[in-house]
């Protein structure tokens, strides 16, 4: 077979299960300052499906702080400020990548992990189940 | 500052700017099958601020496919199906981590990158600017 082109400066990779462990450069490219989302947008307050942001902190994880959205109401807020329970506030979730220290407390050894986070809430029409 | 406890089995990291490059185990923990979000939830269609999902693929990035939400309307959909332009559909954005191959042809060298993605849309009351 044809060999994979390889730069002479590449780490070695003869293991048949390669790459299980890779070198990752943490000088983050395209970085936007990751601040409390309350500062970057007030949608959480102005939405018809408003949410609260809960700080999820884990010193063994990168990023160590993740903000989780929790919808304030089961229903959606109407123009008059009352909650309409004929509609539903639901969390919009996304799977994200994080780095977890492994072994624990080792500053430069990590495992890639996928976690599901709630980013915000949206107002949806409920699914009505009709009983025969 | 408080020193990070160090296991004797940890890789060495004397660089004062440490960690610039870390070892990452890519056997992903907590994996949920990462599929087209259209299959995992129909909120994008049922929301009062519905959105379309656009495929953003990059063969040199992990995850290689990211689904981007684009709000369908400027306004929000009312119960009768018409759009209310006194309200606004807005994207909920989140900064996520991705891995990008670096140097270009090294199969086990990556750079961590932050990108901003739109996860879904929510309906908000507009900010009205009153002219004096």
């Amino acid at each position: 077979g044809i060999a994979i082109p390889r730069n002479s400066g590449c780490p070695n990779s003869e293991d048949k299960n390669f790459p299980r462990t890779v070198m990752v450069n943490l000088n983050i490219h395209n970085r936007n300052t990751s601040t409390n989302p309350k500062r970057s947008s007030d949608y959480y307050n102005r939405s018809t499906s408003p949410w609260n942001l809960h700080r999820n902190e884990d010193p063994e994880r990168y990023p160590s702080v993740i903000w989780e959205a929790k919808c304030r109401h089961l229903g959606c807020v109407k123009a008059d400020g009352n909650v309409d329970y004929h509609m539903n506030s639901v969390p919009i979730q996304q799977e994200i990548l994080v780095l977890r220290r492994e072994p624990r407390h080792c500053p430069n050894s990590f495992r890639l992990e996928k976690i599901l986070v709630s980013v915000g809430c949206t107002c949806v029409t409920p699914i009505v189940h009709h009983v025969a | 500052g408080i020193a990070i406890p160090r296991n004797s089995g940890c890789p060495n990291s004397e660089d004062k700017n440490f960690p610039r490059t870390v070892m990452v185990n890519l056997n992903i923990h907590n994996r949920n099958t990462s599929t087209n979000p259209k299959r995992s939830s129909d909120y994008y269609n049922r929301s009062t601020s519905p959105w379309n999902l656009h495929r953003n693929e990059d063969p040199e990035r992990y995850p290689s496919v990211i689904w981007e939400a684009k709000c369908r309307h400027l306004g929000c959909v009312k119960a009768d199906g018409n759009v209310d332009y006194h309200m606004n559909s807005v994207p909920i954005q989140q900064e996520i981590l991705v891995l990008r191959r670096e140097p270009r042809h090294c199969p086990n060298s990556f750079r961590l990158e932050k990108i901003l993605v739109s996860v879904g849309c929510t309906c908000v009351t507009p900010i009205v600017h009153h002219v004096a």
């Epitope: 044809i2 | 990462s34 990059d58 063969p59 040199e60 990035r61 290689s64 191959r101």
Partner: antibody, heavy 120, light 112 residues
Framework: QVTLKESGPGILQPSQTLSLTCSFS??????????VDWIRQPSGKGLEWLAH???????YYNPALESRLTISKDASKNQVFLKIANVDTADTATYYC????????????WGQGTTLTVSS | GVLMTQTPLSLPVSLGDQASISCRSS???????????LEWYLQKPGQSPKLLIY???NRFSGVPDRFSGSGSGTDFTLKINRVEAEDLGVYYC?????????FGGGTKLEID
């Protein structure tokens, strides 16, 4: 050395389901960044990309055929499978599997192909 | 999807001559990341395709330097200097910048 080999039924009747197997060696689908694609080529014609599966079980299909395609894998056996439902004479082709790595190019190794004839 | 159009359909050449194959895409295939995922494959008679060129102009490992790729946006060219007998077959361009991925219709390189 990376090798891939396709196998299939050879002949099917219209409306049957095609089951193809790609058996490979020299790499693992337990490895980060590895994937396998299916591509087909009707006799004397060009190439058409069908489907792809990544090591983490992420799957993608050609939208023109998506409703009929199912790709899956058994990483422990070094195999990838493709099913095509409700075949027709237009599905008569040589079917190739190829390896893909997360990186700057797509299909770096190909199998020899397996031929399917759909005939009543 | 993106339509990839190759010209000519058939290219008769004499051994030792230069051959040039054109591939045109129906829209720009510059990816949002700045790269152009345009590849060239050669399928020799009775064989499966083999990767020659990736990202417009990069030769894959083991590919002789008489093969070169060029172009940008929507227009791409594969050139073969000093054609040898082992170069005969059908050449396909391929784009991986926009989903779903698409191949050109092929150009058959044959002896004049």
């Amino acid at each position: 050395q990376v090798t891939l080999k396709e196998s299939g039924p050879g002949i099917l009747q219209p409306s049957q389901t095609l089951s193809l197997t790609c058996s490979f060696s020299g790499f693992s689908l337990n490895t980060f960044g590895m994937g396998v694609d299916w591509i087909r080529q009707p006799s004397g014609k060009g190439l058409e990309w069908l489907a792809h599966i990544w090591w983490d079980d992420d799957k993608y299909y050609n939208p023109a055929l998506e409703s009929r395609l199912t790709i899956s894998k058994d990483a422990s056996k070094n195999q990838v499978f493709l099913k095509i439902a409700n075949v027709d004479t237009a599905d008569t082709a040589t079917y190739y599997c190829s390896r893909r790595e997360l990186g700057p190019y797509f299909f770096d190794y190909w199998g020899q192909g397996t031929t399917l004839t759909v005939s009543s | 999807g993106v339509l990839m159009t190759q010209t000519p359909l058939s290219l008769p050449v004499s051994l030792g001559d230069q051959a040039s194959i054109s591939c045109r895409s129906s829209q720009s295939i510059v990816h949002s990341n700045g790269n152009t995922y345009l590849e060239w494959y050669l399928q020799k008679p009775g064989q499966s395709p083999k990767l020659l060129i990736y990202k417009v102009s990069n030769r894959f490992s083991g590919v002789p330097d008489r093969f070169s790729g060029s172009g940008s946006g929507t227009d791409f060219t594969l050139k073969i200097n000093r054609v040898e007998a082992e170069d005969l077959g059908v050449y396909y361009c391929f784009q991986g910048s926009h989903f779903p991925y698409t191949f050109g219709g092929g150009t058959k390189l044959e002896i004049d």
